[in-house]
């Protein structure tokens, strides 16, 4: 499932090339392993900002598909309470390109530990 998430992220990256979306998104660029679930939930919410601002059906569908895959993959450890992690609002705001790169990194963390 996480591998499919990465391919959806690549697809989103390709789709936004032709668009002008200047949104900045809360991005965890240095995820601590003990906060990866919290960080993933922030990434998943921020991803929907891209969908909200683009108005593009392909982006909307790909974002939704990614969220389905990621939530299902998270469900086994999504209820784990991670303490001492940053709230989404405390993260740095980055442009979409940097956001998607960091997203790929955190997904790889999940792949490596599954």
């Amino acid at each position: 499932n996480w591998v499919n998430v990465i391919s959806d992220l690549k697809k989103i990256e390709d789709l936004i090339q032709s668009m002008h979306i200047d949104a900045t998104l809360y991005t965890e660029s240095d995820v601590h392993p003990s906060c990866k679930v919290t960080a993933m939930k922030c990434f998943l919410l921020e991803l929907q900002v891209i969908s909200l601002e683009s108005g593009d059906a392909s982006i909307h569908d790909t974002v939704e598909n990614l969220i389905i895959l990621a939530n299902n993959s998270l469900s086994s450890n999504g209820n784990v309470t991670e303490s001492g992690c940053k709230e989404c609002e405390e993260l740095e705001e980055k442009n979409i390109k940097e956001f998607l790169q960091s997203f790929v990194h955190i997904v790889q963390m999940f792949i490596n530990t599954s």
Epitope: Y26, T38, K41, C42, L44, L45, E46, Q48, L52, E64, I67, I68, N71, S75, G78, N79, E87, C88, E89
Partner: antibody, heavy 125, light 111 residues
Framework: QVQLVQSGAEVKKPGASVKVSCKAS????????ISWVRQAPGQGLEWLGW????????KYAQKFQDRVTMTTDTSTSTAYMELRSLRSDDTAVYYC??????????????????WGQGTMVTVSS | QSVLTQPPSASGTPGQRVTISCSGS????????VYWYQQLPGTAPKLLIY???RRPSGVPDRFSGSKSGTSASLAISGLRSEDEADYYC???????????FGGGTKLTVLG
């Protein structure tokens, strides 16, 4: 397109309960949340609470904590809001709205879009 | 209980620029985003502005949001008759973990 269709108007007696439904289409219902908001005649908007259709987590406004129950049925992509011990001041239009939060920690950065058409609930003896 | 204060009414003529304010206490608006919803007569509310100033796709750029200190504003430029509606600000109270709405502002387009 994303659409939320709510059940029809209800007339209830004080002390009774009402259950309003909200049927979603055009998106993966079980991956997101639903918030419920009400509007008394000629008044402003008031948030009642949120439910995640993904995991069933709920967060209710303090004011309604002991009288409201929100549920979802993912097999029919429908959310429900039940309000008990109705009083005349519960007379209002009740709205459901799609909420991007599937997890509680996402709630503080969420938004409500789109909204259902509303369900008028009248409480009168 | 946290409160967001909006003027009950505002008005303008077609083509004009109108601003609607939303004020909160010192502690709240500064560290929380403000959202704006438009409710046309007899219809459900619609998301107009989110996270202080961002516009969802499909919302005309005549609508803009801003925030300064403890007050947020919605500006509508090039006012049109179809902008006649109720406008609500909202924010998330992190202490209570609840959404709070302002009392709403009824915008009338004159003439």
């Amino acid at each position: 397109q994303v659409q939320l269709v709510q059940s029809g108007a209800e007339v209830k007696k004080p002390g009774a309960s009402v259950k309003v439904s909200c049927k979603a289409s055009g998106y993966s219902f079980s991956s997101f949340g639903i918030s419920w908001v009400r509007q008394a005649p000629g008044q402003g908007l008031e948030w009642l609470g949120w439910i995640s259709a993904f995991n069933g987590y709920t967060k209710y406004a303090q004011k309604f904590q002991d009288r409201v129950t929100m549920t979802t049925d993912t097999s029919t992509s429908t959310a429900y809001m039940e309000l008990r011990s109705l009083r005349s001041d519960d007379t209002a239009v009740y709205y459901c709205a799609r909420d991007p939060a599937a997890w509680p920690l996402q709630q503080s950065l969420a938004w409500f879009d789109p909204w259902g058409q509303g369900t008028m609930v009248t409480v009168s003896s | 209980q946290s409160v967001l204060t909006q003027p009950p009414s505002a008005s303008g003529t077609p083509g004009q620029r109108v601003t609607i304010s939303c004020s909160g206490s010192t502690s709240n608006l500064k560290r929380n985003y403000v959202y704006w919803y438009q409710q046309l007569p007899g219809t459900a509310p619609k998301l107009l502005i989110y996270r202080d100033r961002r516009r969802p796709s499909g919302v005309p750029d005549r609508f803009s949001g801003s925030k300064s200190g403890t007050s947020a504003s919605l500006a509508i430029s090039g006012l049109r008759s179809e902008d006649e509606a109720d406008y609500y600000c909202a924010w998330y109270d992190r202490e209570l973990s609840e959404w709070v709405f302002g009392g709403g502002t009824k915008l009338t387009v004159l003439g």
